[in-house]
Amino acid sequence: WELTILHTNDVHSRLEQTSEDSSKCVNASRCMGGVARLFTKVQQIRRAEPNVLLLDAGDQYQGTIWFTVYKGAEVAHFMNALRYDAMALGNHEFDNGVEGLIEPLLKEAKFPILSANIKAKGPLASQISGLYLPYKVLPVGDEVVGIVGYTSKETPFLSNPGTNLVFEDEITALQPEVDKLKTLNVNKIIALGHSGFETDKLIAQKVRGVDVVVGGHSNTFLYTGNPPSKEVPAGKYPFIVTSDDGRKVPVVQAYAFGKYLGYLKIEFDERGNVISSHGNPILLNSSIPEDPSIKADINKWRIKLDNYSTQELGKTIVYLDGSSQSCRFRECNMGNLICDAMINNNLRHADEMFWNHVSMCILNGGGIRSPIDERNNGTITWENLAAVLPFGGTFDLVQLKGSTLKKAFEHSVHRYGQSTGEFLQVGGIHVVYDLSRKPGDRVVKLDVLCTKCRVPSYDPLKMDEIYKVILPNFLANGGDGFQMIKDELLRHDSGDQDINVVSTYISKMKVIYPAVEGRIK
């Protein structure tokens, strides 16, 4: 019996087609992805093949103005239109709190939403009961397939799930649910979830009875043969893991941003064992036409976005200096504003020991593309912020050793004076450079704001200590020459859309007046 699994993950609000790098589509003839194009391909496969499941491994939420405005209603609507069969909860599904998940998505989805390792307690337990499930048995043709869901246990550090959801260890939580499916005579089981490729592989290895793992969170691109675009494969598709009980378990993921549709064919024997698996992600490029009905509906929904982008978010009573003449040479108040917003967006998980789990921000000055003049009545709009941060990136959470941070700050000024983009703006950091010294030895003082303290203060950076830092995904991926970050980071979790972070902060503060205050000397 053959099953076709179509899968997406980490779509992050890319409802419209995008450019090849998943930013705003400029030249339509070279654009990719989007739900209208995805629909065309999915329908084509459904017509051609008998047993097709369409699955999503989480993080539909967060990433463009679509999510900012529609807050998840757009996800439910278009996923319903595509007739998804199941979705696993990702960490970003909690970005607007539990209510922001329940109302727009859980109550509106016409497909099961899954996570076996999230347990509700207290007053939330009855409110959310039945709205998401640990597993679902889906009839497919003349057979049944069990889908069991999982979500990153780091979600409380990455999003806003509140205090009434407990995120258990994935493997510990999955095993009893898989065992339950076995007792229900379900012998074909897919683990669908959002914990990253390393955890996906562990699930394949450790959870007895899981036949296939469909993952997300790490934006992993797997491919067999010559890859069709810029993404470099992290391994073959499917990636085969040998389980502890000797089975070959295929593990798949489909990069991110709706650029590819994962396509996996699995052959099962009559006892539900995987006989063979093969496939590849399908690049959703312009050779696949956008479905006209979906496209027309996208255009209808778009109208509200255009209106939103010119509305006032808040006011500034000072000039927001985002000029390259400032931000690539010295501390600039636009850099301070953005870093403050980045830290503010990550205020969560305080306890008796820690006032917050992260206190530091770094931001390449070259990523700040425009100032905002306060003389326009002080008004700040989404449109203004889109000029400052035009690349559609995210502000991510990484863990780095102090020694890596020191290298990053040396790189920041290794060719100072040439108006290059690697000059770092900061938050929660005081750095002193001596530019008379030779490149690679110019950082003379680097103090960082403590997190394990009741009164935050600046302490010297310790080379062997592990620190959490918020930074643009561009830097986490080694952009602007920050190869040391990419090579040496110990953990990387994707965060929220850059403009959304700053706009939320400005809306919260109402009036802003960021200063140049001696963070960089």
Epitope: Q43, R46, L53, A81, K110, P139, D142, D297
Partner: antibody, heavy 119, light 108 residues
Framework: QVQLVQSGAEVKKPGASVKMSCKAS????????MHWVRQSPGKSLEWIGY????????TYNPKFEGRATLTVDTSASTAYMELSSLRSEDTAVYYC????????????WGQGTTVTVSS | DIQMTQSPSSLSASVGDRVTITCTAS???????LHWYQQKPGKAPKLLIY???NLASGVPSRFSGSGSGTDFTLTISSLQPEDFATYYC?????????FGAGTKLEIK
């Protein structure tokens, strides 16, 4: 043109089962969900459930879960509904209905199958 | 479940009259997923208006729909003889899908 043609009227005894068919034509059968709705004499419309023809995935109204079974034969572009453990209150006209994929309205209706449950 | 309450349950009117039928949902329904059907005796229902206010193909412009949240209306601006029928509202904003009990429009 797009149409749904349903099987003929049935008379059944309480406790029995009935299986009715709905043949689709004029469109790609797998592209649209097929719903089943019933209407008791002089009453309103009541939704039973739907099936995704491309993979036979089903969603039921909890009221009919376990008693209604929806199936398809894609090669024949035909949907089926079986209702078991019939009782007199199941006497109704049963419609198969195609739904729009974007806004889930019912744009094409079958002519209906009359089921009479009587001892 | 979302209950859909239609009023009136029946209505007598004359050709040329303006008629309004209301549909009240027990909880908020997105206007995108609120639809109206017309049914004549012995026939299957027929789609009349979809997504609150959009006329289905071939439906005369004397029919219109409006509303949001929990309150929706179907209006016939000038009744014609062929409009005498039963009208149903329907939501599939949330599962299970539900219909109103119907409004029977009769000739006075």
């Amino acid at each position: 043109q797009v149409q749904l043609v349903q099987s003929g009227a049935e008379v059944k005894k309480p406790g029995a089962s009935v299986k009715m068919s709905c043949k689709a034509s004029g469109y790609t059968f797998t592209d649209y969900n097929m719903h089943w709705v019933r209407q008791s004499p002089g009453k309103s419309l009541e939704w039973i459930g739907y099936i995704k023809p491309h993979n036979a995935g089903t969603t039921y109204n909890p009221k009919f879960e376990g008693r209604a079974t929806l199936t398809v034969d894609t090669s024949a572009s035909t949907a089926y509904m079986e209702l078991s453990s019939l009782r007199s209150e199941d006497t109704a006209v049963y419609y198969c209905v195609r739904s729009d994929f974007l806004y889930w309205y019912f744009d094409v209706w079958g002519q209906g199958t009359t089921v009479t449950v009587s001892s | 479940d979302i209950q859909m309450t239609q009023s009136p349950s029946s209505l007598s009117a004359s050709v040329g009259d303006r008629v309004t039928i209301t549909c009240t949902a027990s909880s908020s329904v997105s206007s995108s997923y609120l639809h109206w059907y017309q049914q004549k005796p012995g026939k299957a229902p027929k789609l009349l208006i979809y997504s609150t206010s959009n006329l289905a193909s071939g439906v005369p412009s004397r029919f219109s729909g409006s509303g949001s949240g929990t309150d929706f209306t179907l209006t016939i601006s000038s009744l014609q003889p062929e409009d005498f029928a039963t009208y149903y509202c329907h939501q599939y904003h949330r599962s299970p899908l539900t219909f109103g009990a119907g409004t029977k429009l009769e000739i006075k």
